[in-house]
């Protein structure tokens, strides 16, 4: 995912000026760049700390430049270094005087493991001293004096990694100042295999791109792309994308372009020499001009892009029919995503020809991680990759980077990401009303932890103690009404904030518990009291069917009128009637009953009733006759309270007549308090009697009452208040 | 602020009647629930009664069902309490007090009521 | 109705000494519905404690709640001067009724 180059400008040192430039091209490392003196490579090097500037003209590219009064300090071994995910990917290259006795054949080179090697060093001066070749500093081959040839070879027949390393030639009299440096790459695996066992099939890399052993993937050389280097870049561009530009007059001239591993360095296509200031010769092209161009149908030879295909051919040598290649281009995505945390599915769209398949795009996080698409579908024009983050974070904002690989060309897109965190609040909602069916609720949804703004918010509630799912409503404002709740149960609430964007769904707050009021069942119907002797009381109901499963019980409230006496009982709730006991005969009580779950109901309205008498009532008073007629006459008269009087009984006879003659009326509501005799004699007189009657036995009449009929015509005298029977 | 303050309290003989008020402010008023709290001399607090904000709707306790009845003016932020056929042993400090979470989170200074022959 | 007893009735200690005071439910008070009020000679009562364990605002951290269930504990750690006053607790888990304890008194030594 790094795309990191380093520039060698020139890696043969005159008095001119000299630089190193190290760009980490479309990629925004989290850790700086650095250029460095390469100990490992040659340990008696200048000791000297370089001075290392930022690239005006790149956003991410160092420099070091040496004045030509500095070409002294400068001989030695470096490298560029970047890292990614703390992993380091590491350019090396090497600066030697122009002057230098011996001249490699090339900065480095690249063999495979196995292959026949020879490093060469071209005499440059003649010297009559031994010549002496180093490996990283130490001595491994000599030549005499007078054999040293124009060509000076090590010879490696089987190389292998560990023969890997900066070889170094000059005469034995000479120094580090006149040694001539090349570098031998040693890939790890065999010609065209790469992974951790060497069994895997490199892809064809052309146009002289190396297969990198680790991870199959062709190193492109500068000017060429995509994933087999096959696509040629727009003039004096570089980079895996070709979105470096060389700025000088003639391109990228003079620039000696070091890869990572296994590549090395070579000159950008169309150019050749150490210093790669050398035009290619015609019909070559590429790195170093290594590249030969075999036309077909006599079409143009670029010496940077090679063969100039006429439309409907493609190849290198322009030697397959079919549709013109085209590089891939990402679109539809924004330069900025405003993501939420939590699962994220990026989609990475492009166009191109041939289209992109699913490994040829990948996504890029920050910290240099390689995504690979969990789905991907393509239509005629488009390939969609879908990639799968399960769970993105606020550290992982930053530019992302849509990466697409194909033969045709290679293009990336970076693009920020802004992960917010999801808002939850900090405070439980409040409960400020409720009742036994509803709750009114402050949602509290300020103050909240993360990020804003609110787009909507949701309170959520359920019962505690039932397996119920929560219950949403949507809300508006802070305050918020539930309704048709149930009476004397537990509730819990929270609150969840939703900010825009997909899964903007933040956790629900702190949760609240609450009790709605308990509401009383109603009180027993047909509540009835009676006495049943001097002792108790009855009291009755009709039998309760309870709406809910809860355990209920009728709970009985009796007190004395006379006396400050109060006694509560519990009644199970399957039975219709309890007896009031241990009272006191001729007393007034007063009785009321709820019926109670575990919470209390409603009392009923007070029933009175008085225990029976233990004594004989006492006598009606205040008897009258009234409403006397030839034929009638109306009796009325009150009883005493508390005497248990269950009937009054009215005896009437003509006066003088036999005891035995006598009329009885018996009126057996003891409430009431008037009666009219009916079918008298005219002018009679009569002797009428009046007592009462309880459970102990009737009261005694002190004396008799006289009544006189009138004669036929007269009208009838006044009738007196109170309840009659007729 | 929140500020409670009760006012009508005084003396009576037994069955006779008094209505205390309760003026709220800094807060809003009708949506909370209300209650009244009273405090017997040298005795322990006892919940009294309570009217809901939203639809009035009232609680009492047992021993003042049936002779106290709850209140509230809602445009004025007032409850009120009507005590009648007062006992002796209604005689106490009355506090209005506002309901949060069914725990009273601010209090009045308290009336007296103070019923004897 | 819950029926709340508070003990001891009276609670006799020294400035900076420790203060524990227990309210004993009748019935379980599911999830911590209890509260604790302070009150001073001639006062309204004051919040402490709700939801058994929760400050109410502006309550120094001195005061503490605890308990579930049936019992509960209002801790005062380092008794001031201004701490020696009555304690209320009180259930709003089962109501109506909404009930007091009988209070805790304490009293400087």
């Known amino acids: 995912a790094m795309d990191l180059i380093l520039i060698n400008s020139l890696p043969l040192v005159s008095d001119a000026e000299t630089s190193l430039t190290c760009i980490a091209s479309g990629w925004r490392p989290h850790e700086p760049i650095t250029i460095g003196r390469d100990f490992e490579a040659l340990m008696n090097q200048h000791q000297d700390p370089l001075e290392v500037t930022q690239d005006v003209t790149r956003e991410w590219a160092k420099k070091v430049v040496w004045k030509r009064e500095k070409a002294s300090k400068i001989n030695g071994a470096y490298f560029c270094e970047g890292r990614v995910r703390g992993e380091a990917i590491r350019i090396r290259t090497m600066k030697m005087r122009q002057q230098a006795s011996f001249l490699p054949a090339t900065l480095t080179m690249t063999v495979d493991k196995g292959d026949n090697v020879n490093i060469s060093f071209k005499k440059v001066l003649i010297k009559e001293e031994d010549a002496v070749i180093y490996k990283n500093g130490s001595f491994i081959h000599s030549v005499p004096r007078h054999e040293v040839p124009d060509i000076l070879e090590v010879h490696l027949p089987h190389a292998q990694p560990q023969d890997a390393g900066v070889y170094s030639a000059r005469y034995i009299g000479g120094n580090l100042f006149t040694s001539a440096f090349t570098r031998l790459i040693v890939r790890r695996c065999e010609a065209q295999k790469w992974g951790p066992e060497c069994n895997h099939l490199c892809t064809a890399c052309m146009n002289n791109g190396v297969c990198h052993e680790d991870t199959g993937e062709c190193i492109c050389p500068p000017g060429f792309m995509g994933r087999t280097c096959e696509k040629a870049c727009e003039l004096h561009t570089f980079g895996r994308t070709c979105k470096e530009r060389c700025s000088g007059q003639e391109g990228c001239k003079s620039y000696v372009f070091c890869l990572p591993d296994p590549y090395g360095c070579s000159c950008a296509t169309g150019w050749k020499g150490l210093q790669c200031n050398e035009a290619c010769h015609p019909g070559f092209y590429g790195p170093d001009c290594k590249l030969r161009c075999s036309c077909n149908n006599g079409e143009m030879c670029d010496r940077f892009q090679g063969c100039l295909c006429s439309p409907g051919w493609q190849g290198l040598q322009c030697e397959r029919e079919g549709i013109q290649r085209m590089t891939p281009k990402i679109v539809d995505l924004p330069d900025h995503i405003e993501v939420n945390s939590g699962k994220f599915n990026p989609i990475c769209k492009a166009s191109g020809w041939p289209l992109p398949t699913n490994e040829e795009m990948t996504l890029v996080k920050p910290d240099g991680t390689v995504l690979h698409p969990k789905d991907f579908n393509h239509t005629d024009h488009f390939s969609v990759a879908i990639f799968t983050i399960h769970r993105i974070l606020p550290p992982d904002s930053g530019v992302w980077v849509c990466s697409v690989n194909t033969v045709a060309g290679m293009v990336e897109k970076p693009f920020n990401i802004s992960v917010k965190v999801l808002p939850k609040p900090l405070n439980a909602p409040n409960v400020i009303d409720t009742g036994h069916n509803f709750a009114v609720i402050n949602i509290s949804s300020e103050p909240y932890f993360g990020d804003g703004p609110i787009k909507s918010k949701k309170l959520l509630y359920k019962p505690v103690n039932h397996y119920e799912a929560w219950q949403h409503i949507q809300v508006t404002n802070e305050i918020v009404t539930l309704n048709y709740l149930e009476p004397r149960t537990e509730y819990e609430l929270c609150v969840q904030l939703v900010r825009r964007g997909e899964g903007g769904e933040g956790h629900p707050g702190p949760v609240r518990r609450f009790t709605t009021a308990s509401i009383g069942l109603p009180p027993p119907r047909g509540l009835n009291l009676l006495p049943k002797s001097q002792t108790t009381l009855n009291l009755t109901w009709q039998p309760i069917f309870p709406s809910s499963e809860d355990d209920f019980y009728v709970e009985v409230e009796r007190r004395s009128v006379q006396k400050s006496d109060q006694q509560n009982i519990k009644v199970p709730g399957n039975l219709t009637s309890v007896l009031l006991n241990n009272l006191h005969p001729r007393e007034q009580y007063v009785v009321r009953a709820r019926v109670n779950t575990k919470a209390q109901g409603e009392w009923s309205e007070d029933l009175t009733a008085w225990t029976l008498s233990d004594i004989l009532p006492p006598q009606p008073e205040n008897i009258k006759i009234s409403n006397i007629t030839h034929s009638s006459a109306v009796i009325s008269w009150t009883i005493l309270d508390g005497y248990s009087i269950s009937s009054i009984t009215i005896r009437y006879k003509v006066q003088g007549k036999n005891e035995d003659q006598h009329v009885d009326v018996k009126i057996k509501n003891a409430t009431i308090t008037q009666y009219q005799l009916k079918g008298l004699e005219p002018e009679t007189a009569y002797q009428v009697d009046i007592f009462a009657e309880n459970n102990i036995g009737s009261s005694n009449p002190a004396f008799s009452h006289e009544l006189v009929t009138l004669p036929e015509s007269q009208a009838p005298a006044d009738l007196g208040g109170g309840k009659m029977l007729l | 602020d929140v500020q409670l303050v009760e006012s009508g309290g005084g003396v009576v003989r037994p069955g006779e009647s008094l209505r205390l008020s309760c003026a709220a402010s800094g807060f809003s008023f009708s949506l909370y629930a209300m209650n009244w709290v009273r405090q017997a001399p040298g005795e322990g607090l006892e919940w009294v009664s309570r009217?809901?904000?939203?639809?009035?709707?009232?609680y009492y306790a047992d021993s003042v069902k049936g002779r106290f009845t709850v209140s509230r003016d809602n445009s004025k932020n007032t409850l009120y309490l009507q005590m009648n056929n007062l006992r002796a042993e209604d005689t106490a400090v009355y506090y209005c007090a506002k309901t949060l979470n069914n725990f009273f989170d601010y209090w009045g200074l308290g009336t007296l009521v103070t019923v004897s022959l | 109705e819950i029926v709340l007893t508070q003990s001891p009735g009276t609670l006799i200690l020294s400035p900076g000494e420790r203060a524990t005071l227990s309210c004993r439910a009748s019935q379980s008070i599911s999830n911590t519905y209890l509260a604790w009020y302070q009150q001073k000679p001639g006062q309204a009562p004051r919040l402490l404690i709700y939801?058994?364990?929760n400050r109410a605002a502006d309550i120094p951290d001195r005061f503490s709640g605890s308990g579930s269930g049936t019992d509960f504990t209002l801790t005062i750690t380092r008794l001031e001067p201004e701490d020696f006053a009555v304690y209320y607790c009180q259930q709003y888990y089962d109501w109506p009724p909404l009930t007091f304890g009988g209070g805790t008194k304490v009293e400087i030594k």
């Open positions: 009217i809901s904000g939203r639809d009035g709707y009232t």
């Open positions: 939801d058994a364990s």
